[in-house]
Interface confidence: low
Amino acid sequence: FEIALPRESNITVLIKLGTPTLLAKPCYIVISKRHITMLSIKSGERIVFTFSCQSPENHFVIEIQKNIDCMSGPCPFGEVQLQPSTSLLPTLNRTFIWDVKAHKSIGLELQFSIPRLRQIGPGESCPDGVTHSISGRIDATVVRIGTFCSNGTVSRIKMQEGVKMALHLPWFHPRNVSGFSIANRSSIKRLCIIESVFEGEGSATLMSANYPEGFPEDELMTWQFVVPAHLRASVSFLNFNLSNCERKEERVEYYIPGSTTNPEVFKLEDKQPGNMAGNFNLSLQGCDQDAQSPGILRLQFQVLVQHPQNESNKIYVVDLSNERAMSLTIEPRPVKQSRKFVPGCFVCLESRTCSSNLTLTSGSKHKISFLCDDLTRLWMNVEKTISCTDHRYCQRKSYSLQVPSDILHLPVELHDFSWKLLVPKDRLSLVLVPAQKLQQHTHEKPCNTSFSYLVASAIPSQDLYFGSFCPGGSIKQIQVKQNISVTLRTFAPSFQQEASRQGLTVSFIPYFKEEGVFTVTPDTKSKVYLRTPNWDRGLPSLTSVSWNISVPRDQVACLTFFKERSGVVCQTGRAFMIIQEQRTRAEEIFSLDEDVLPKPSFHHHSFWVNISNCSPTSGKQLDLLFSVTLTPRTVDLT
């Protein structure tokens, strides 16, 4: 190989061992019988050399540094050449470095031809191995602007006082052009300006200077985003740290076209703007840091650019001003994403503060809009608390558990609407009365409606789930001893059409000791399936539940249990079941941990089924499933 560097070229070539060097298989640069591991060639020198091994690329790297002095003479602006040409260099991993020194009053602009650049974070690498490392200068201190790959959005970087650009090319890469040019600009009065151009939908992740280390104290850095007017941009902060400020405040400032309040100032912990049409600027301003404990300011953020949806131009009013103790959350439904570029899906408050989830609270009127390619990606979860603190005031009081129409009119599917029903301990109990009788969801007879009510205890220490119930059954009411949550869960978009079928009234009633009482009025010719609460996990210890089953005068009820034995094994106490005729008070008692469950039995009058649990041994829980079927009395049942 021969490398000849012209005089006054201000180029230095350095060939040195890369890492890791494996010294047991030594490879040397050979110059007239001398074996050396490092070679430096300066302007005006011509050197002929070879390598002592077959694959020098596994051992050596080459650095070509060109110093460009704009202090003492004119700056050579324009397209930057790779000198010496890559074809004249040995095939080693090569780094071309351009070190440009200029006055503070001169702005320098690096312009990147297509493909533009994509910033990468610490620990990331570029797929093709080609990296651009860009640094600036503040007085004598070097500041890392960032490391970039090809195929991104960054088109220009403006700095002042000097710039150091390192282009790293792997030995096998055919690139023979620098891909950028340098232009002079007026002073930018800040650390740097990075221009990011979006041609269409896409995203860019960008970082503050020196990331992940601290942003220089009291500095200003700006990103200019060029976005087609028909697209919308949203900013989200992926990672940030705040330093300890002595004077001034760290902040981000947005210059948003059309905004009457430019610049809009945000704290880093604020929700950042979304749904911005067209170009905008974002600036990061540092502060004067505490000398004793400076901390670090750093920021990594993402800009997402996408088409606005029809919904994004509509404003929805959610009036919760008359509600109390209620919160509504719109959030992404959990799904596996497979598309390469997934447009963001945001909900915006007052059209500007957009985020992937939003919680609205009662007592106010809220204006929301959506910035989302597919609103089925979002759903709504609502929580409302109805509590009684004074038992004398609440007794016999009723509340309707209805989803407010304002919520039903939103273009987002309702997932859960939960009512937390709270009563004073040992003073009051609750009764739930549905507008339409309910069916309990079982494997044998699953619900196939668009919504169900999930009823569970709301006492933190108690793990008690009464079950899932849907309209169209035989359960007339459910009485529960103490605090519960009732969740209306939707299963299909058709809930909007079936919303009229929802309707549940809760009343506060005198306290009773049983955990739950189900009032069942079976319809003729249909089989009613009922099961004990906490199915699959077992009825909690020492819990008692009853079913009040009505039998019309002209009907006979057949009570059938679906297994021979209950399977429960008691550690302490007894588990038993009582079947009691309501008219005669005649009762049969079964020891569930010893006896065989009763064979199908026929009841001419209304009757009770009461099941009380012991303290079972783990793994031997009490789960019972039974059915009630009505048949006309005229049929001979023998």
Partner: antibody, heavy 118, light 112 residues
Framework: QVQLQESGPGLVKPSETLSLTCTVS????????WSWIRQFSGKGLEWIGY???????NYNPSLKSRVTISVDTSKNQFSLKLSSVTAADSAVYYC????????????WGQGTLVTVSS | DIVMTQSPLSLPVTPGEPASISCRSS???????????LDWYLQKPGQSPQLLIY???DRASGVPDRFRGSGSGTDFTLKISRVEAEDVGIYYC?????????FGQGTKLEIK
């Protein structure tokens, strides 16, 4: 933490080919040299050869005619084949990673005993 | 091939006492880089060898500072300042200057 695991048959018949595989986990097989070393029952250690992820290799001249070391970067594995084995090739076979400076073997597998017998 | 010779072949030591193992190579292991291409390994009973010292005197990570490697050219020494019960096993030196790498025959350290 880098881990190496040898696998292969523990018994090989004389004149057949001994085949072992070393699976590297907890790190990439790229950018290091990977060696096979064996230890005879008398506790003596013998270096067999190394391979680089590009396929470049180097063998102990005493075994060169019988040994082949290959690499599969997609599986993070490298393999040893030793042909025409005799009882003298019975040993515990180790795979090891060669550290960047020195070189030295900074990570070793737990070893696999291979017996050559009919 | 470079021949490596260790002595002694067996070394009984009382816990808390120092120990010294010698390793001699048939030719100089001093590389043009200025490093000696000699490594020390310890093989504890039932285990794989583990690296103690590389480049003649550099301790591997996690190796206690009671282990010290010294020497240059053809004569090298591994010293243990205070032997502990966990130090028992066979100590090997290995040259890494030339292919093939070659090992010493091993020194068995045992507790008295």
């Amino acid at each position: 933490q880098v881990q190496l695991q040898e696998s292969g048959p523990g018994l090989v018949k004389p004149s057949e080919t001994l085949s072992l595989t070393c699976t590297v986990s907890g790190g990439s097989i790229s950018s290091y040299y990977w060696s096979w070393i064996r230890q005879f029952s008398g506790k003596g250690l013998e270096w067999i050869g190394y391979i680089y992820y590009t396929g470049r290799n180097n063998y102990n001249p005493s075994l060169k005619s019988r040994v082949t070391i290959s690499v599969d970067t997609s599986k993070n594995q490298f393999s040893l084949k030793l042909s025409s084995v005799t009882a003298a090739d019975s040993a515990v076979y180790y795979c090891a990673r060669e550290g960047g400076w020195g070189p030295h073997f900074d990570y070793w597998g737990q070893g696999t005993l291979v017996t050559v017998s009919s | 091939d470079i021949v490596m010779t260790q002595s002694p072949l067996s070394l009984p030591v009382t816990p808390g006492e120092p120990a010294s193992i010698s390793c001699r190579s048939s030719q100089s292991l001093l590389h043009s880089s200025g490093y000696n291409y000699l490594d020390w390994y310890l093989q504890k009973p039932g285990q794989s060898p583990q690296l103690l010292i590389y480049l003649g005197s550099d301790r591997a990570s996690g190796v206690p500072d009671r282990f010290r490697g010294s020497g240059s050219g053809t004569d090298f020494t591994l010293k243990i300042s205070r032997v502990e019960a966990e130090d028992v096993g066979i100590y090997y030196c290995m040259q890494a200057l030339q292919i093939p790498y070659t090992f010493g025959q091993g020194t068995k350290l045992e507790i008295k």
